[in-house]
């Protein structure tokens, strides 16, 4: 069964910078990736980036750079200019489409131990979901 993994990582050098890494585990080629974010329990979500293997990428603030890492994984750099606890309680979701097979989504958030005062980010743990 295809699966999607998501890692959310705080940059060690800049506490207001985050990176979301997402990947697809399964057969087939990726036709589109959509990254979205919002509050817990599906509240107040919106798109951050859309990546098409041929047509390119589009991103919306606070996304800084969306890019393909491999043919089946992407990364999205985020810049937070807000409060002292950046992206706290924020859920990031990645949805990979493989046409015509189907599409799969998984979501993740910054691990609770990611205190802005830490000198280095924690090791991100993949979150897997197969619906």
């Amino acid at each position: 069964t295809p699966e999607v993994w998501v890692q959310v990582q705080m940059e060690a050098t800049e506490l207001s910078s985050f990176t979301v890494h997402c990947g697809f585990l399964g057969p087939g080629s990726i036709s589109l990736v959509t990254v979205s974010w919002g509050g817990p329990d599906g509240a107040g979500g919106t798109k951050l980036a859309v990546l098409h293997p041929e047509l390119g990428t589009r991103q919306w603030a606070p996304a800084r750079q969306a890019r393909w890492e491999t043919q089946s994984s992407i990364s999205l750099a985020l810049e937070d200019s807000g409060a002292s606890s950046p992206f706290a309680n924020t859920t990031f979701c990645c949805k990979f489409a493989s046409f015509p097979e189907g599409s799969w989504e998984s979501c993740g958030s910054l691990p609770p131990s990611s205190d802005p005062g830490l000198s280095a980010p924690p090791t991100p743990v993949p979150i897997l979901r197969a619906d």
């Epitope: 979500g45 859309v50 189907g102």
Partner: nanobody
């Protein structure tokens, strides 16, 4: 796995109304823009309407403006298309899709350019 299941299609007389529904599962529906696209017999895929994630912004192709209304109920994970004053030229298979084709300014659409897609529901407008 993401699933989008359309319903509500059928045969209707010109001037009549139909309400299409799209039940979504397997993803965080409330985070995503959703659209309706259609494919008339022997024609290519045509964008019909898009609604943003919270339902606050909608857009329509000129040919359906004032006749069709897109809406969503995020608490029910459902997308709707209310179609009034139907015309013969509205006859098509209607697909519920995740995404907004305007992201890339697509002129010739394909279902593969969307993040998720349903199996479609047939709407026939005929007397």
């Amino acid at each position: 796995e993401v699933q989008l299941v359309e319903s509500g299609g059928g045969l209707v007389q010109p001037g009549g109304s139909l309400r299409l529904s799209c039940a979504a599962s397997g993803f965080t529906f409330s985070y995503y823009d959703m659209s309706w696209v259609r494919q008339a017999p022997g024609k290519g895929l045509e964008w019909v309407s898009t609604i943003n994630s919270d339902g606050g912004r909608t857009s329509y192709v000129d040919s359906v403006k004032g006749r069709f209304t897109i809406s969503r109920d995020n608490s029910k994970n459902t997308l709707y298309l209310q179609m009034n004053s139907l015309r013969a030229e509205d006859t098509a298979v209607y697909y519920c899709v995740e995404g907004d084709p305007h992201n890339f300014g697509l002129e010739s659409l394909s279902l593969r350019d969307f993040g998720s897609w349903g199996q479609g529901t047939m709407v026939t407008v005929s007397s």
